[in-house]
Interface confidence: medium
């Protein structure tokens, strides 16, 4: 069962899945100037049996210039309603990711893939949050959100995370100093495109989990 909406957004924080539940789909998106090869897969699918999970299908991109009659591929309307995006991560994997039964690793990059990955999560998927660079958490413990099914509807639990600017000792948390760059938060209600920026390469994650940068919903 696909999750109906996006993991919740937290100001000055990004999220990342450490492993992907079977049934998760990853759109085959190509960077500008490239397109999916003709008859190429629309998406990769995490599938498997009790002992092993892996991504079915391969994403392949080719230069748009080779056939200028072909338009850039965009997701169909029914695909668009569940767009979850994360910026491409380092291929390094967190230590425990491979050992989770019924889960796939982060798929390796493919040639000329888009800079953002669009996932379609399934019920039971967990994502972890981290404050963006320059901000720190006011809570301790892993900040996670899980897609749950209740009364026939899916919902994401709310992560218990507040990110504060490290330099703001006398101000309230999260209040930004004027900067040249805009905040860069999406305003769309229909597709919350949360991009994970610099997730401190995942090998640090295991250590980080023990310290202060994540926290859980306690209700």
């Amino acid at each position: 069962e696909l999750c109906d909406d996006d993991p919740p957004e937290i100001p000055h924080a990004t999220f990342k899945a450490m492993a992907y539940k079977e049934g998760t789909m990853l759109n085959c998106e190509c960077k500008r100037g490239f397109r999916r090869i003709k008859s190429g897969s629309l998406y990769m699918l995490c599938t498997g049996n009790s002992s092993h999970s892996s991504w079915d299908n391969q994403c392949q991109c080719t230069s748009s210039a080779t056939r200028n009659t072909t338009k850039q591929v965009t997701p169909q309307p029914e695909e668009q309603k569940e767009r979850k995006t994360t910026e491409m991560q380092s291929p390094m994997q967190p230590v425990d990711q491979a050992s989770l039964p019924g889960h796939c690793r982060e798929p390796p990059p493919w040639e000329n893939e888009a800079t953002e990955r669009i996932y379609h999560f399934v019920v039971g998927q967990m994502v972890y949050y981290q404050c963006v660079q320059g901000y720190r958490a006011l809570h301790r413990g892993p900040a996670e959100s899980v897609c749950k099914m209740t009364h026939g509807k899916t919902r994401w639990t709310q992560p218990q995370l507040i990110c504060t600017g490290e330099m703001e000792t006398s101000q309230f948390p999260g209040e930004e100093k004027p900067q040249a760059s805009p905040e860069g938060r999406p305003e769309s209600e229909t597709s919350c495109l949360v991009t994970t920026t610099d997730f401190q390469i995942q090998t640090e994650m295991a250590a980080t989990m023990e310290t202060s940068i994540f926290t859980t919903e306690y209700q």
Partner: antibody, heavy 116, light 107 residues
């Protein structure tokens, strides 16, 4: 079941001090940020102060900065608000709150009246 | 600080009515907006978070929408227990700030 119980409110003269306490139970207090929110009689709500899980980060609204101090005792599962140099405009019901991103659990509030 | 302005300040309606309360922020709050209900002598209760997500246990007649600086709380069919004061609150940047409230009264 999260429970927050405030105490320490009362009537106090301008310029005097008061210390509010909030006893927390039903969750891992030492993992969570806590805050004080106040509401003047018949008026709206405003955030007063916030403290990180370990007490290392504290934030205050401008009007109370330098007069109020938020602190916590994780061993006792208690949050405090030390209010000095109280003013008439500090008169309000003070709520202790947590769950700041997941639903907000509030205490029942304690009334502080600053009057001569 | 970000100023939150609610309208109307008070509103009279009848059971079964559809009611809309609006909230305008002095700057973009990026959909980081909550709605609360408060009854006399009680602590506030959050109804909606993140502009349009219904808090667990809140009836589906409550809904929220909006983006940027303009947000709306809608009660599709008023029930007797809905007569209360409603507040919006932004959590995009600190200090988090509330609107001045909208008092919903029985006509």
């Amino acid at each position: 079941q999260v429970q927050l119980v405030e105490s320490g409110g009362g009537v106090v003269q301008p310029g005097r001090s008061l210390r509010l306490s909030c006893a927390a139970s039903g969750f891992t207090f030492s993992n969570h940020a806590m805050a004080w929110v106040r509401q003047a009689p018949g008026k709206g709500l405003e955030w007063v102060a916030v403290i990180s899980y370990d007490g290392s980060n504290k934030y205050y609204r401008d009007s109370v900065k330098g007069r109020f101090t938020i602190s916590r005792d994780n061993a006792q599962n208690t949050l405090y608000l030390q209010m000095n140099s109280l003013r008439a405009e500090d008169t309000a019901v003070y709520y202790c709150t947590t769950g700041l991103n997941s639903g907000y659990d509030w205490g029942q509030g304690t009334l502080v009246t600053v009057s001569s | 600080d970000i100023q939150m302005t609610q309208s109307p300040s008070s509103l009279s309606a009848s059971v079964g009515d559809r009611v809309t309360i609006t909230c305008r922020a002095s700057q973009n709050v990026s959909s980081f907006l909550n709605w609360y209900q408060q009854k006399p002598g009680e602590a506030p209760r959050r109804l909606i978070y993140g502009t349009n997500s219904l808090q667990s246990g809140v009836p589906s007649r409550f809904s929220g929408s909006g983006s940027g600086t303009d947000y709306t709380l809608t009660i599709s069919s008023l029930q007797p227990e809905d007569f209360a004061t409603y507040y919006c609150q932004q959590y995009n940047s600190w200090p988090w700030t509330f609107g001045q409230g909208t008092k919903l009264e029985i006509k």
